[in-house]
């Protein structure tokens, strides 16, 4: 049904969905703090621009009676229930910030006539790609997939002289929300990753993964998994690993690798870690003092969602344009705005671009070192360490298939 938007006459409201089922188990109070900090900044920016308007947020809480799993499994209906609540109250803001679960975002997008923008901290899955009024402020699965294909094909670097065309993917179903959708995208038979690879098998049992590590008949030397070093250790332990195995550990929202006093444990020597360029420090933030790195990124995405809305509001008001139009709803893409932690770039489909960093463990220093960076905006890899001190033979990444070419 058509809901009137509280979005005119100098008063602009943001509807923030505070869902019990969330991509990250973050206390809602922390997200409220992030939103409120963003509102203060937006008000300052509008005031600086000579725009005498009011910007507020309305926090919409679900009752939590039915949808109380706490993770994303029962989020589909919770999102729709919250929309119904907004509809009944006849109180919709200029923009909707909140659904972070892929299930809920997909369903809400599907089931509503969206003439307003939706900003999500999450919604990682491929099913949320290419949505005209959806903006995602945490790296979606598509970006990861494009990096992997780019890296697999690369064969002209001093440390990677072979193109790869094969991979195992470890996915046991206990993953966090981000990892679940990242691996889901790699598993999907119709995805870009699957299309570009000649061989790909999903390992679902711990034993399957453990057996591959020393299996002489394995079909690929490369294994992709998602999580932190502790997750890998629980699975791999101190088991022996064939010398030409390469484990790619996707751990995007974890900047602990860059801390000065961090030493890489021995079990990480066969591992390349894919993470995001550090910098989400939020040093001065009241809401971030006790947050883990992942949750910091989640709270930051909420804050940046508010700043993005403020950026677009300022542009439209300065141009004398109406906010409650499809033009506004479709405008949250193909732009750069000043986020809390630096410039934030959104691609043509409203998805955040970032610099991904591939790390290796130096056998000399036992420290994580940057091997290369990848700019998701231009789909380009930039080598950093031209002579890495790898564990692999000749300090080069091995071929992905044992026995094909010199090892």
């Amino acid at each position: 049904s058509q809901v009137s938007q509280n979005c005119h006459n100098g008063s602009y409201e943001i509807s923030v969905l505070m869902m019990g089922n969330s991509a990250f188990a973050e206390p809602l109070k922390n997200l409220e703090d992030a939103v409120n900090e963003g509102l203060e900044i937006v008000r300052g920016r509008l005031q600086n621009a000579g725009l005498n308007v009011t910007v507020n947020a309305t926090f919409m809480y679900s009752d939590g009676l039915i949808h109380n799993s706490g993770d994303c499994r029962s989020s589909t209906c919770e999102g729709l229930d919250l929309l119904r609540k907004i509809s009944n109250a006849q109180r919709m803001g200029c923009v909707l910030i909140g659904p972070s679960c892929t299930y809920s975002t997909f369903q809400m997008y599907l089931d509503t006539e969206l003439s307003y923008p939706m900003i999500s901290a999450g919604s990682f899955g491929l099913s949320c790609d290419y949505k005209e009024t959806l903006t995602r402020l945490m790296s979606p699965a598509r970006k990861l997939m494009y990096f992997l294909v780019n890296f697999w094909k690369t064969n002209d670097l001093p440390f990677k002289t072979y193109s790869w065309s094969t991979s195992y993917v470890y996915k046991n179903g206990t993953e966090t929300e981000d990892c679940f959708w990242y691996l889901n995208a790699l598993e999907a038979s119709v995805s870009y990753f699957s299309h570009e690879l000649g061989f790909k098998v999903v390992l679902r049992q711990d034993k399957e993964f453990q057996d591959i590590l020393m299996d002489h008949n394995r079909k690929s030397n490369v294994i992709i998994m998602c999580g932190g070093p502790e997750f890998l250790y629980k699975l791999k332990g101190d088991r022996a690993v064939a010398e030409d195995i390469v484990i790619i550990l996707v751990d995007l929202f974890n900047d602990q690798y860059f801390e000065d006093n961090v030493t890489a444990p021995d079990y990480m020597k066969n591992v390349l870690v894919l993470t995001l360029s550090p910098g989400n420090s939020l040093l001065n933030s009241s809401f971030s003092r006790n947050l883990s790195p992942t949750k910091r990124d989640f709270a930051l995405a909420y804050l940046n969602g508010i700043l993005l809305f403020g950026h677009m509001l300022k542009i439209f008001l300065e141009n004398g344009e109406n906010i409650t139009t499809p033009k506004f709803a479709h405008a949250f893409r193909n732009l750069t705005f000043e986020g809390y932690d630096g410039p934030v770039t959104l691609d043509d489909w409203g998805d955040v671009d970032s610099t991904m960093v591939l790390l290796y463990t130096s056998v000399d220093t036992k420290k994580y070192k940057v091997l290369l960076t990848y700019d998701t905006h231009v789909n380009k890899t930039y080598p950093v360490d031209m002579s890495p001190t790898f564990t692999w033979k000749n300090s080069k990444l091995p071929n992905d298939i044992t026995g094909r070419g010199p090892q």
């Epitope: 203060e40 900044i41 300052g44 920016r45 005031q47 600086n48 621009a49 910098g279 989400n280 420090s281 939020l282 040093l283 001065n284 933030s285 930051l300 000043e338 986020g339 809390y340 932690d341 630096g342």
Partner: nanobody
Framework: QVQLVESGGGLVQPGGSLRLSCAAS????????MDWYRQAPGKQREMVAT???????TYTDAVKGRFTISRDNAKNTVYLQMNSLKPEDTAVYYC?????????????WGQGTQVTVSS
């Protein structure tokens, strides 16, 4: 009226230190990151360092490891601590704040403070 007031410049010997300050009006300071630029005689103005609202910092390669940018939220002031100064650091240093513009830096500039590194 937005004001950015720089101070702390002066004459210093190579290897010496200086601390520049930039006081800003609160509505600017609390809304945007802030930059230090410099302009040497006969050269173009160049970015030196940025501090974002989060406190994250970025530096040009020429000053990395020698200069430190910081902000004091209680005083609405940004600082540039300059150590191991070199003759090539000689320039007028400008504070830059406000909304980013398409052309040159942010919308507001201070009047600049002269830093001369010479023996």
């Amino acid at each position: 009226q937005v004001q950015l007031v720089e101070s702390g410049g002066g004459l210093v010997q190579p290897g010496g230190s200086l601390r520049l300050s930039c006081a800003a009006s609160s509505n600017i300071f609390r809304a945007y990151g802030m930059d230090w630029y410099r302009q040497a005689p006969g050269k173009q103005r160049e970015m030196v360092a940025t501090i974002w609202l989060s406190g994250r910092t970025t530096y040009t390669d020429a000053v990395k490891g020698r200069f430190t940018i910081s902000r004091d939220n209680a005083k609405n002031t940004v600082y540039l601590q300059m150590n191991s100064l070199k003759p090539e650091d000689t320039a007028v240093y400008y504070c830059n704040a406000g909304a980013p513009t398409a052309s040159s830096g942010r919308q507001y500039w201070g009047q600049g403070t002269q830093v001369t590194v010479s023996s």
